[in-house]
Amino acid sequence: APISSHCRLDKSNFQQPYITNRTFMLAKEASLADNNTDVRLIGEKLFHGVSMSERCYLMKQVLNFTLEEVLFPQSDRFQPYMQEVVPFLARLSNRLSTCHIEGDDLHIQRNVQKLKDTVKKLGESGEIKAIGELDLLFMSLRNACI
C-alpha cells in the first residue's frame, strides 16, 4: 500500500485559475500540432489494474517522466506558456518526492513503461502529444493526489 500521507497534494495547487489556464492553454497549443489523435497516453489503459490508492504514485512517475524527458528538452517551444507551466509542474513533482509505495510496484511500472515506450516510439511527435495531454496530466494528478 502507498505511504499515503506522502502521496498527497494540497487542493490549493489545483485551484489557481491563472496557472490552471496556462496549463490548459499549453496543452491546447501543443494538441493543435498533434495529428495522431487515435493514440492516448493518459487514459484508461494507464490506470488498468492500479488501485485508487496507488494512482497518485503512478501519476508521480508519469509527471517525472514528462518533466525530464519531454518538457525540459522541449522547453524553448510553446512560449510563453512553457516557461510558466514547467516550474509549476516541477513544484508538484518536488512535493511528491517522498511519495513511495511499499511492496511490489511492478504493475505500476509496467503501465508507466508502456506510456514511455509510446512516447519514445513516436519520437518528437510523441513529445508533442505528451505536452498536448498536460490538461489530462493536471486532472489525473488532481483526481489521484488530493
Partner: antibody
C-alpha cells in the same frame, strides 16, 4: 471510414427487454469505449452509461442502474445495450457514441435505434 | 450531478446573422465541454470539444469559448445549413450531462 452502425427499430411491450447492438468499424475498437445516449420524442439528450471496449468496465447513470446492462464483443467489434422492465417512457431513439471514457467527447455517433414501448 | 443550463431555448435568426448560445455549468468543469449540432431525424454531430477546439471537418464559422462555469458557442455568419438544435455537454464528471438544447430557427 470510422463508423458505428446500430441495429434496427424495435417495438416492445411494457415489462419486456430490448437489446440494441452497435457495430464499430474503421478504428481499433479496444482503444475506445462506447457511451449510450437516448432521446425521447421531442426531448433532449440523456446519457445512460459507458462501457470500456478494452476492459469491459462500465459506468451507468444512477437512473438506469439495475435495469441496464452494457456489454461488448471484441471479436466482432460490437457493443450492446440491454434495457429491461421497459415502460412507455422508455420510448426513445437510442444512440451509441464513441468515447474514451476519460475526459473525452463523443466524436462518432451511431445512426440511432428507435425503441417503441407500447401495449 | 452537474446541471447544464443552456440559453436561449429557441433562437430566431436570419442567414448571415452572428449567433451566440450560452451554457452554464452548476460547478466548475475546467474546459471539459463539448457542443453538438442535431438536425431532425439525425444523430448529433460533434462541433466543439475542450470548450474551444474545432472538431474535424467543422466549418471555421463555429467557435467556442469559456472555461469553468460559463461557455459560449458562436456562429459568426449563420448559413442555411446551420438551422438545427445545439446541445452543450460536460464530460468533467460522471454522470455526463447535457444542456436542454437551443433550437436555431429561421426568422
Amino acid at each position: 471510414q470510422v463508423q458505428l452502425v446500430q441495429s434496427g427499430a424495435e417495438v416492445k411491450k411494457p415489462g419486456a427487454s430490448v437489446k440494441v447492438s452497435c457495430k464499430a468499424s474503421g478504428y481499433t475498437f479496444t482503444s475506445y469505449g462506447i457511451s449510450w445516449v437516448r432521446q425521447a420524442p421531442g426531448q433532449g439528450l440523456e446519457w445512460m452509461g459507458w462501457i470500456s471496449a478494452y476492459t469491459g468496465n462500465t459506468n451507468y447513470a444512477q437512473k438506469f442502474q439495475g435495469r441496464v446492462t452494457m456489454t461488448t464483443d471484441t471479436s466482432t467489434s460490437t457493443a450492446y445495450m440491454e434495457l429491461r422492465s421497459l415502460r412507455s417512457d422508455d420510448t426513445a431513439v437510442y444512440y451509441c457514441a464513441r468515447d474514451r471514457g476519460y475526459y473525452d467527447a463523443f466524436d462518432i455517433w451511431g445512426q440511432g435505434t428507435l425503441v417503441t414501448v407500447s401495449s | 450531478d452537474i446541471q447544464m443550463t443552456q440559453s436561449p431555448s429557441t433562437l430566431s435568426a436570419s442567414v448571415g446573422d452572428r449567433v451566440t448560445i450560452t451554457c452554464r455549468a452548476s460547478e466548475g468543469i475546467y474546459h471539459w465541454l463539448a457542443w453538438y449540432q442535431q438536425k431532425p431525424g439525425k444523430a448529433p454531430k460533434l462541433l466543439i470539444y475542450k470548450a474551444s477546439s474545432l472538431a474535424s471537418g467543422v466549418p471555421s464559422r463555429f467557435s467556442g469559448s469559456g472555461s469553468g462555469t460559463e461557455f459560449t458557442l458562436t456562429i459568426s455568419s449563420l448559413q442555411p445549413d446551420d438551422f438545427a438544435t445545439y446541445y452543450c455537454q460536460q464530460y468533467s464528471n460522471y454522470p455526463l450531462t447535457f444542456g436542454g438544447g437551443t433550437k436555431v430557427e429561421i426568422k
